[in-house]
């Protein structure tokens, strides 16, 4: 079974800068999985943001601006990255990655 680790306990960024979060997949080939990213804002329910599937297809939550989040997959390091562009106060949240095995 696959295992996920998010090595960054926290990330602090200046407003309008870019944040990059990592999710390391082990126990399974990342190219054979779909990785999902979610966020949980303080006091709010968890929300799906974006996913990347085994074939590279990217899906995002409806209503999220197209340039806000970027998801990628690096097979060499078995890592999925979530890039958050133009960081603003409403991006303060806990971000989770999840795995779906094909």
């Amino acid at each position: 079974a696959g295992h996920l680790e998010q090595p960054q306990i926290s990330s602090t960024k200046t407003l309008s800068k870019t944040a990059r979060l990592e999710c390391v997949v082990s126990g399974i080939t990342i190219s054979a999985t779909s990785v999902y990213w979610y966020r949980e804002r303080p006091g709010e329910v968890i929300q799906f943001l974006v996913s990347i599937s085994y074939d590279g297809t990217v899906r995002k939550e409806s209503g999220i601006p197209s340039g806000k989040f970027e998801v990628d997959r690096i097979p060499e390091t078995s890592t999925s990255t979530l890039t958050i562009h133009n960081v603003e106060k409403q991006d303060i949240a806990t971000y989770y990655c999840a795995l779906w095995e094909v």
């Epitope: 297809t57 990217v58 899906r59």
Partner: nanobody, 125 residues
Framework: EVQLVESGGGLVQAGGSLRLSCAAT????????MGWFRQAPGKEREFAAA????????YYADSVKGRFTISRDNAKNTVYLQMNSLKPEDTAVYYC??????????????????WGQGTQVTVSS
């Protein structure tokens, strides 16, 4: 509402090239990932190529990889499909499509919000 209008199709000899364009009007173009599909006579519509919202990622069907190039100009609200080394089996009606929430080869046709009317490409041997 987004309107998509394809152009650039035509008749070309095998080995030749064509450049298809898809002009979008309506809502903000950069809000949409774009795809090109094709439908040959008597066959189902199939994925050919796609490009992400920003243009940083491109995707291709195996049958066109290395011959076709998809690109977009968000300032001109246009997506392009450069088709080189054309083969008779590339003969089809080519459609462009726009998706607000999905980008890539695995996007289902119903995940595309808008479609163009298509442009005919005929490759003669």
């Amino acid at each position: 509402e987004v309107q998509l209008v394809e152009s650039g199709g035509g008749l070309v000899q095998a080995g030749g090239s064509l450049r298809l364009s898809c002009a979008a009007t309506g809502r903000t173009f950069s809000e949409y990932a774009m795809g090109w599909f094709r439908q040959a006579p008597g066959k189902e519509r199939e994925f050919a190529a796609a490009i992400s919202w920003t243009g940083s990622k491109t995707y291709y069907a195996d049958s066109v990889k290395g011959r076709f190039t998809i690109s977009r100009d968000n300032a001109k609200n246009t997506v392009y499909l450069q088709m080189n080394s054309l083969k008779p089996e590339d003969t089809a009606v080519y459609y462009c499509a726009a998706s607000s929430d999905c980008s890539g080869p695995g996007c289902h046709t119903e995940e595309y919000d808008y479609w163009g009317q298509g442009t005919q490409v005929t490759v003669s041997s």
